[in-house]
Amino acid sequence: AILGRSETQECLFFNANWERDRTNQTGVEPCYGDKDKRRHCFATWKNISGSIEIVKQGCWLDDINCYDRTDCIEKKDSPEVYFCCCEGNMCNEKFSYFPEMEVTQPTSNPVTPKPP
């Protein structure tokens, strides 16, 4: 809901609901937070009949699930809302879906957001 700022890290920012939320639609988001916390970037998107619809991108809080991930990759099998997080400036510019399946070999579905 509410935007913050910092000098520690930058992530690609996007908000599909920018008009309703009265935020920018896209840009660079400086991340902020307590000095003892790690910062991450994230991307959230939907796959509507094969069409990728980005929901949000930006900074993410200290999250062990994001540690040491240089690439933004969703590994859950067929979620309704896709989510990935990563470490490194602007690491959420590209995001991918590599479902973790026991039998089937995972396939790469890299996604690069189109400029608005």
Partner: antibody, heavy 120, light 107 residues
């Protein structure tokens, strides 16, 4: 140590106005979004309003839209909630809370709350 | 608005018990789910954020799990100071919404 201290609550008649304040200390206030959350007596939590780090973006619950205004003064490290046209159902303890990022708003620090009673 | 439904609304447990509270969202919210603890007359306190991450200063007996629509807060071994009301909250979309709360009482 992060501290948030609300003030300005009290008894007000229906249709009246009240201005709540939240004094912040122990962190760089101008780096953080802030929110107001309320809790009616014996009830659960209800988000009321939020504002981003520089006051450029604000958001309101439908129940208070057009009646309440959130604002901040970063030079004074203070958050405000101007409440107009108050109704009995606005009676609650009002908490200010520090926000995380706009998209994953975990409220990591809260004030102790200030009670607003709307009654004739 | 996204509706958050908690269950149970209250439960009785003993010190040392394993306690599980569930929260269901009316639509998928990915991992945008936070948990708060509130004691009578006190402000809420953040316990878990982003569905699974432990907030600063919170004991490791608290854990969160889930993604999408179904989430769980677990207290592995209930301590006397854990008796309180717990709320889930979604931050996927405006307005931010809370569950109705789960009161954990002493058996």
């Amino acid at each position: 140590e992060v501290q948030l201290l609300e003030s300005g609550g009290g008894l007000v008649q229906p249709g009246g106005s009240l201005r709540l304040s939240c004094a912040a200390s122990g962190f760089t206030f101008s780096d953080y979004g802030m929110n107001w959350v309320r809790q009616a007596p014996g009830k659960g939590l209800e988000w009321v309003s939020g504002i981003n780090y520089n006051g450029g973006y604000t958001s309101y619950a439908d129940s208070v839209k057009g009646r309440f205004t959130i604002s901040r003064d970063n030079s004074k490290n203070t958050l405000y909630l101007q409440m107009n046209s108050l109704r009995a159902e606005d009676t609650a303890v009002y908490y200010c809370a520090r926000a995380a990022n706009w998209h994953d708003t975990a409220l990591d620090y809260w004030g102790q709350g200030t009670l607003v009673t709307v009654s004739s | 608005d996204i509706q958050m439904t908690q269950s149970p609304s209250s439960l009785s447990a003993s010190v040392g018990d394993r306690v599980t509270i569930t929260c269901r969202a009316s639509q998928s919210i990915s991992r945008y789910l936070n948990w708060y603890q509130q004691k009578p007359g006190k402000a809420p306190k953040l316990v878990i954020y982003a569905a699974t991450s432990l907030a600063s200063g919170v004991p490791s007996r608290f854990s969160g799990s889930g993604s999408g629509t179904d989430f769980t807060l677990t207290i592995s071994s209930l301590q006397p100071e854990d008796f309180a009301t717990y709320y889930c909250q979604q931050s996927y979309d405006n307005p931010l919404t809370f569950g109705g709360g789960t009161k954990v009482e002493i058996k």
